[in-house]
Interface confidence: low
Amino acid sequence: MRWCLLLIWAQGLRQAPLASGMMTGTIETTGNISAEKGGSIILQCHLSSTTAQVTQVNWEQQDQLLAICNADLGWHISPSFKDRVAPGPGLGLTLQSLTVNDTGEYFCIYHTYPDGTYTGRIFLEVLESSVAEHGARFQIPLLGAMAATLVVICTAVIVVVALTRKKKALRIHSVEGDLRRKSAGQEEWSPSAPSPPGSCVQAEAAPAGLCGEQRGEDCAELHDYFNVLSYRSLGNCSFFTETG
């Protein structure tokens, strides 16, 4: 019952973010990331440059709620995602058994007091196939369209070379030179693999939500904030900020 109330309240917060005073914080995210179909990925956000108290973090995909970590109630995973979504590490979210349908925008929504709501955006692309970097946990993504284009170009060039070889042998060197230059250019333009999940820049003031610390004072502070739902402090999640 409490989670039902919380879900209703959470949606309300998204639509009408709290805004009491200047919001100085920033959300750093893993940005645009890619992963292989069937694999796992960690989505991570990091709230920094504010001393605001984090009271709840929502993870959403487009307009679907994936998970909530609430300071009183701990983690809640939406029933429709419970088989594929797991909490952590940290305030992050692990998506497992990825499908192409998981491609899209993900949002971490930090509800803070007194600042209000901070939202971070991550774009996840789930690829049909990718080349695994030896020994790495996460796959190095390849841009499918780019690879396909490169194959088509190479094939076309090879065909042209084969057809013209008999007639104009001297032009072969020129075509191969062009191909080498084109390949080199393609490599330079090709984006490098994204940083590993969570490797955002650590800001000077970096509050993080921590679950599991039995800090009564933090939970007590939340009573006023959550009193509309008449929460009883369970001490499950203690979100507090660090400023140095």
């Epitope: 419970k82 970096a206 599991g212 369970l234």
Partner: antibody, heavy 118, light 107 residues
Framework: QIQLQQSGPELVKSGASVKISCKAS????????INWVKQRPGQGLEWIGW????????NYNEKFKGKATYTVDKSSSTAYMLLSSLTSEDSAVYFC???????????WGQGTTLTVSS | DIQMNQSPSSLSASLGDTITITCHAS??????LSWYQQKPGNIPKLLIY???NLHTGVPSRFSGSGSGTGFTLTISSLQPEDIATYYC?????????FGGGTKLEIK
């Protein structure tokens, strides 16, 4: 207070299986991952993986896939780890530990000593 | 996998000394590093989380610092009860990994 109580020492034969339990109390069991950590005699700590009791989701260290299987019984707030096809390499102390949102293990079980005999 | 290289592997110091243990991650782990103390025959105990935050009940002579790939655990005014093995652990990505440990002895 928060406690993780593990089952007692086990002496099993090579090739057999063993199920280790970890009973949680003092907090909402379904809100935190239960991790399993291995420590061989005189050696360091090795993360095996975790299970999230709220959903049953699991995360395995690739090294232990096929060796360890995690389950939970929410009604008794107990997590279990089944270790199969045991060899002498599996002789170790196995800890359960709670993993919350802060990227750390804040509460640990007392450890279960597993001895695999040939 | 992220490798955690801890040094030194063993350390001998006198009571009252200040000692430093370092932990180097093979890739950027931001501040997602914890330190644990394990006394002989005992369970690991959390000392520091998020690189520099003291866990509840841990004496203030323990401190942690660092971010990115380099981290240190400092124990000032060494006490007899500090005899233990100390481990670092990264929480940046799976699999979660620990350092090899630093065994601290009193001279």
């Amino acid at each position: 207070q928060i406690q993780l109580q593990q089952s007692g020492p086990e002496l099993v034969k090579s090739g057999a299986s063993v199920k280790i339990s970890c009973k949680a109390s003092g907090y909402t069991f379904t809100a935190y991952c239960i991790n399993w950590v291995k420590q061989r005699p005189g050696q360091g700590l090795e993360w095996i993986g975790w299970i999230f009791p709220g959903s049953g989701s699991t995360n395995y260290n690739e090294k232990f896939k096929g060796k360890a299987t995690y389950t939970v019984d929410k009604s008794s707030s107990t997590a279990y780890m089944l270790l199969s096809s045991l060899t002498s390499e599996d002789s170790a102390v196995y800890f359960c530990a709670r993993y919350g949102l802060g990227h750390y293990f804040d509460y640990w079980g007392q450890g279960t000593t597993l001895t695999v005999s040939s | 996998d992220i490798q955690m290289n801890q040094s030194p592997s063993s350390l001998s110091a006198s009571l009252g000394d200040t000692i430093t243990i370092t932990c180097h991650a093979s890739q950027n782990i931001n501040v997602w590093l914890s330190w644990y103390q394990q006394k002989p025959g005992n369970i690991p105990k959390l000392l520091i989380y998020k690189a520099s935050n003291l866990h509840t009940g841990v004496p203030s002579r323990f401190s942690g610092s660092g971010s990115g790939t380099g981290f240190t655990l400092t124990i000032s005014s060494l006490q007899p009860e500090d005899i233990a093995t100390y481990y670092c652990q990264q929480g940046q990505s799976y699999p979660l990994t620990f350092g090899g440990g630093t065994k601290l002895e009193i001279k």
